[in-house]
Structure formats: C-alpha cells, structure tokens
C-alpha cells in the first residue's frame, strides 16, 4: 500500500496473507475471508504456483514479523480459479480458496460481507484498500498491515487512463487524480472494502495498475458484485450449503 498508515488489531479481520513455502517462505498476495472455509482472492496470484500444498494462509494477523514456525495457518483444500480467466488477458481475475478446515470466528478473524448481485446503484463514498504490499514501486513487503482511503472512479474515467486496455464492466477502479495513494505489489488479491449504511462490504479484489500511486493511473480491482452468481455457485456446489456473509 502506497501512502497508507498502520492498521490496528481487529480493524480488518477478514484480511488474510497468502504465503508460499518453497525453500523460504514469503508473502505473495492478500485475500479476504468470506466464510468459515472460504477465502476470495485474485486468480493471478496462482499463475505459476497452482500447487495447493505450497500455500499457507494466515488469518487474524496484523504484523507479518510475528509469524514464526509455530504460528497456526490454514492449508488449501481446493483452488477454484474463474473458468474465464486467462493468463494472457487478465480479465476475470478472481479465485476462491476452500480451506482444509473451517476457521472459528474471533474479534480478529471474521468474514467480510459480500455485495448484492450486480450492485450498480450503491454509491460508495468511504472505501479502503488494505495489504502488506510495497509502500513504493521499488519497495518491499511491509510488516504491519497497511490501510489507505481511496475514492472510487468511474469506469469511463478509468478507461481514459488506460487507453490501451479494456476496462470491463466487471472491473472497478479507485484512485486519486494526483496519485500518491494506491495498492502495490504484494497487495494483489486483497480487499477493497467500502462502508455503507454502517456495514463493510467487499467491493473489489486488488488486481492491477500501471505502477503504483502514479498520477492519473488508478488501481483496477475485480468487481465482486459482478461475480456473486459464480461465488455462490462454487461455494454451494462444494459445500452443499453456502456459509457466505451476504448483506442482510
């Protein structure tokens, strides 16, 4: 996160760290807890690393430097990448992770509510992006979970900023015209959440941007509302019954 500040314990209890253990262990992506056994993240996090057993998912964590060999983590039972995601395109950048064992909810580890299907009418004015990613383009992973308040921008505005790309309906953009605040490398897959009527909702999944926090280059996020049917279908067919946090 560029231009952010330290988060507090329990402030973003749905935020998880997706880490890979090969020879060493490192944080690669963020994710959002959306049910006892489900994490929502970006499909591109698994490019070149589709093997379930190399991944460790840490929840209820604020400071990555607190993680030791004794820190509990979740393992992956199943990775469900959106069927239309292609490495060559970058559209449909969304994936579900089914955990091997369900998590108990605590003050520091609980799910984020999902938006209503096809939610286009809600005007979100209080949106935040969180993650342990770089604090500048040529930076490094941060220890303490960072947060930054970023306004949504229209897809039309976003398309002007990215003339050589296609900003699809299933994407949502956020950023300041002057730059300075944004997600960055290592924040991929993490949440863009907005508070509306006193409730936090998962509006976007951190996907891509041209550099980080550059002027007139907003961050691009997968628009979760456009994938509600897919999320429900995959979690229900795998679970028998869904355990999602949908809005009341």
């Amino acid at each position: 996160i560029v231009g952010g500040t330290n988060s507090s314990w329990g402030e973003w209890p749905w935020q998880v760290s997706l880490q890979v253990k090969l020879t060493a262990q490192r944080h690669l992506c963020g994710g959002s807890l959306i049910g006892h056994q489900w994490v929502l993240t970006a499909a591109h996090c698994f490019d070149g690393l589709p093997l379930q057993d190399v991944w460790r998912i840490y929840s209820g964590i604020l400071n990555l430097s607190d993680i030791t060999k004794d820190t509990p983590f979740s393992q992956i039972k199943e990775i469900i990448i959106h069927q239309n995601y292609k490495v060559s395109e970058g559209n449909h950048d969304i994936a579900l992770i089914k955990l091997q064992a369900p998590l108990n909810y605590t003050e520091f580890q609980k799910p984020i509510c999902l938006p209503s299907k096809g939610d286009t009418s809600t005007i979100y004015t209080n949106c935040w992006v969180t993650g342990w990613g770089f604090s500048k383009e040529k930076g490094e992973i941060q220890n303490i979970l960072q947060k930054v308040n970023i306004p949504l921008v229209t897809n039309e505005e976003c398309q002007k900023a990215y003339a050589d790309a296609k900003i699809a309906q299933a994407m949502v953009c956020a950023g300041y015209k002057e730059g300075g605040k944004d997600a960055c490398k290592g924040d991929s897959g993490g949440p863009l959440v907005c508070k509306h009527n006193g409730m936090w909702r998962l509006v976007g999944i951190t996907s891509w941007g041209e550099g980080c926090a550059r002027r007139e280059q907003p961050g691009v996020y997968t628009k979760v509302a456009e994938y509600m049917d897919w999320i429900l279908e995959k979690t229900q067919s795998s679970d028998g019954k869904a355990q999602m946090q949908s809005p009341a």
């Epitope: 591109h44 490019d47 395109e89 970058g90 050589d164 490398k185 991929s188 550099g211």
Partner: antibody
Framework: EVQLLESGGGLVQPGGSLRLSCAAS????????MTWVRQAPGKGLEWVSY????????IYADSVKGRFTISRDNSKNTLYLQMNSLRAEDTAVYYC??????????????????WGQGTLVTVSS | EIVLTQSPGTLSLSPGERATLSCRTS???????LAWYQQKPGQAPRLLIY???SRATGIPDRFSGSGSGTDFTLTISRLEPEDFAVYYC?????????FGQGTKVEIK
C-alpha cells in the same frame, strides 16, 4: 487454436502504397491489443505499431509515423496496416502478433504470444 | 527510447553445453514487460519467456530467464540441436517498444 494469417505483401515502387491484412482466429480478437513487427532482410526485429482492443488508441514507431496507419475491424477479426509513401528501407517481412496482457504482482504483463507467418513487402523501382 | 543491448552477438557452442545470453537495457524496465523470443531461419519468432522469468506454454524447462531492472539473462541449461537459432529480448515497458539486436547461437 490461435492463428494469425497475414496477406497483402508484394512489390511496390518507392512512394507507393500497400495495405496489409492479418486475419485472426481461435481467440476473442476484440479482447486483445494487436501489433505489427517487421524484419528487414538479414536484420533484426523492429516494432512498428500497436492498436488497442477497441481500436481507439494507436502508437507508432518514429520511423513510420505519419506514413503508416494501423486499424482493426473487430467484426471481421482482422487487423490492418495501411502503408503510404513507402521507402526502400521499409522493405521487410511484416508480422502481425497478438499482445498478451496478463497480470503479475499487481502489474500488467505484456508480450507477443502468437505471431503470423509474415508477409514480404519489397519497395523497389 | 529504451535501447536493448544483447551480448554476445554470436555464441558458438556444442550440443549439451550451457548457453548464457545477456540483455541490458538503457533504462529501468519493469520485469513484467521483458520477453525473450527465438527465431529460426525462414520462421516467425516464437515466444520463450515473458515477465523476465516465466516460461511460455510448451517451452522446455531447459530455458530459463532471470534478472531485473536493467540486466536480464536467458539461460539454456543444455543445448539441444533444435536450440541453435537467433534469440531476441524485447521490452514493452515504454513506447516505442524495442527489441535487442539479437544473439545468434550457432553450432561450434
């Protein structure tokens, strides 16, 4: 199977014009940025131009700017290169290529993942 | 314009040997925008490596890419007879997109 098939090359006099076409199949053409790359006989590869998926955004190499125009017809899955005021130094094999733009570490990736077989353009009097 | 300089110009090696090809860029290039291509006589180029280190579909694991910033490397761990060709690095970080001048890997 992704296929790109160029056509329209041939012999043309200096100052003349030619229009190259590239017929695409096996993928959703309208989702991809497309590019032209050329290779003079016995020389290396030179990027010429690219066009955005919608066709609304184009960029050219300085060597062809103002003389060449890239365009596309997404309804026909076809990419074009209109070449005017041709010079001897434009003699080359012209390749069309698909530009893959995925995502890695929250940044786009960009690379030419499929190429046509090329069409030879010879500019000579 | 970002200039890509490949070295050596020609590499004379025997099958089974290791080939190390260098590509230096005149300005910083985000590694996501650095690719390597192989070209054989009379054929179109073929994508080998994208994002500086990711192998393209169907490319054997004897090909590997590495590097960041301004210094990138293509390594062929054990040359097979079909690997003798010209190799190009290419950047699409900034327009104009540019290629290196190529390294020819020939049989010694």
């Amino acid at each position: 199977e992704v296929q790109l098939l160029e056509s329209g090359g041939g012999l043309v006099q200096p100052g003349g014009s030619l229009r190259l076409s590239c017929a695409a199949s096996g993928f959703t053409f309208s989702h991809y940025l497309m590019t032209w790359v050329r290779q003079a006989p016995g020389k290396g590869l030179e990027w010429v131009s690219y066009i955005s998926p919608s066709g609304g955004h184009t960029i050219y190499a300085d060597s062809v700017k103002g003389r060449f125009t890239i365009s596309r017809d997404n309804s026909k899955n076809t990419l074009y290169l209109q070449m005017n005021s041709l010079r001897a130094e434009d003699t080359a094999v012209y390749y069309c290529a698909r530009v893959a733009r995925g995502i890695a570490a929250r940044s786009r990736t960009s690379y030419f993942d499929y190429w046509g077989q090329g069409t030879l353009v010879t500019v000579s009097s | 314009e970002i200039v890509l300089t490949q070295s050596p110009g020609t590499l004379s090696l025997s099958p089974g040997e290791r080939a190390t090809l260098s590509c230096r860029t005149s300005q910083f290039v985000n590694s996501n925008y650095l690719a390597w291509y192989q070209q054989k006589p009379g054929q179109a180029p073929r994508l080998l490596i994208y994002g500086a280190s990711s192998r393209a579909t169907g490319i054997p694991d004897r090909f590997s890419g590495s590097g960041s910033g301004t210094d990138f490397t293509l390594t062929i761990s054990r040359l097979e007879p079909e690997d003798f060709a010209v190799y190009y690095c290419q950047q699409s970080s900034r327009t104009p997109w540019t290629f290196g001048q190529g390294t020819k890997v020939e049989i010694k």
